[in-house]
Interface confidence: low
């Protein structure tokens, strides 16, 4: 397995609707046709898989139907969106990229994006 550099933003603030987007960019050493992108969440020294998708170069990412992630790809960049986030989901979200085909296999892991999620304050009752 060969190493590959992956870059992602250090910090992202989720929207009030619990949506966070960030770009994951990888330095592709060759012309991969199949790329695997995995989002990992690290919190309290625990690492869990948030979502994963495979795409063919020049095509859209396909996540499982019940995934909280969506994404698009453009060249060596993947635009990832994670939805349904709550304050408790605040943590370090790591982008892992694998060049699956053709050989050789390359693996790259980013330093992580700290996503901050602030639950919106409930709207006060209004009298009209």
């Amino acid at each position: 397995c060969k190493a590959m550099h992956v870059a992602q933003p250090a910090v992202v603030l989720a929207s009030s609707r619990g949506i966070a987007s960030f770009v994951c960019e990888y330095a592709s050493p060759g012309k991969a046709t199949e790329v695997r992108v995995t989002v990992l969440r690290q919190a309290d020294s625990q690492v869990t898989e948030v979502c994963a998708a495979t795409y063919m170069m020049g095509n859209e990412l396909t996540f499982l139907d019940d995934s909280i992630c969506t994404g698009t790809s453009s060249g060596n960049q993947v635009n990832l969106t994670i939805q349904g986030l709550r304050a408790m989901d605040t943590g370090l979200y790591i982008c892992k990229v694998e060049l699956m085909y053709p050989p050789p296999y390359y693996l790259g892991i980013g330093n992580g994006t700290q996503i901050y999620v602030i639950d919106p304050e409930p709207c006060p009752d209004s009298d009209f």
Epitope: T33, E49, T54, Y55, N59, T62, L64, D65, Y101
Partner: antibody, heavy 117, light 107 residues
Amino acid sequence: EVQLVESGGGLVQPGGSLRLSCAASGFTFSTYYIHWVRQAPGKGLEWVAVIYPYTGFTYYADSVKGRFTISADTSKNTAYLQMNSLRAEDTAVYYCARGEYTVLDYWGQGTLVTVSS
Amino acid sequence: DIQMTQSPSSLSASVGDRVTITCRASQSVSSAVAWYQQKPGKAPKLLIYSASSLYSGVPSRFSGSRSGTDFTLTISSLQPEDFATYYCQQRDSYLWTFGQGTKVEIK
């Protein structure tokens, strides 16, 4: 709603040919793997072949390599399995399934292929 | 190629029992292991993906876990509709392989 409907099964003699079809609807056909998986009577599941319609990428199990050909028509949202030089051991229910990278998340109802003289 | 050895091949259990099915990979694999349920005459249905993620619409009594090369499907409290055959499956490069299956029967 995601749907996969297989057709084309039937009785064929050893050495004969058959073409199975898998009509897909309810999702972007070209951006998912489409698999064929078979199940011999009373036996377990055996993965047969896969295609990624967007690029035409294909791969086969060793047991069918050189005899079976998987293809897809994105204009018809349909995948095919052309089976040549059929043997008695190819007798099975053939399922088509939609796949993400590691899993097969939607399956058709299956079509029975019987190879017998 | 990686082989998935599933055990037991069959088991008898009662409604309410806790049931555990194991798949052992012949060599180190990723967590790209899924579990399916199949009833007679029907197509398989996805239960668990990525070793431990519960698929949409699947009851929470089903769970998956991993320990090294061992992958486990657990049904915490067996229900009448759970009597079926269960298969594990993994992808190794461009081969998708299934375990031999475990038939869960009524005791």
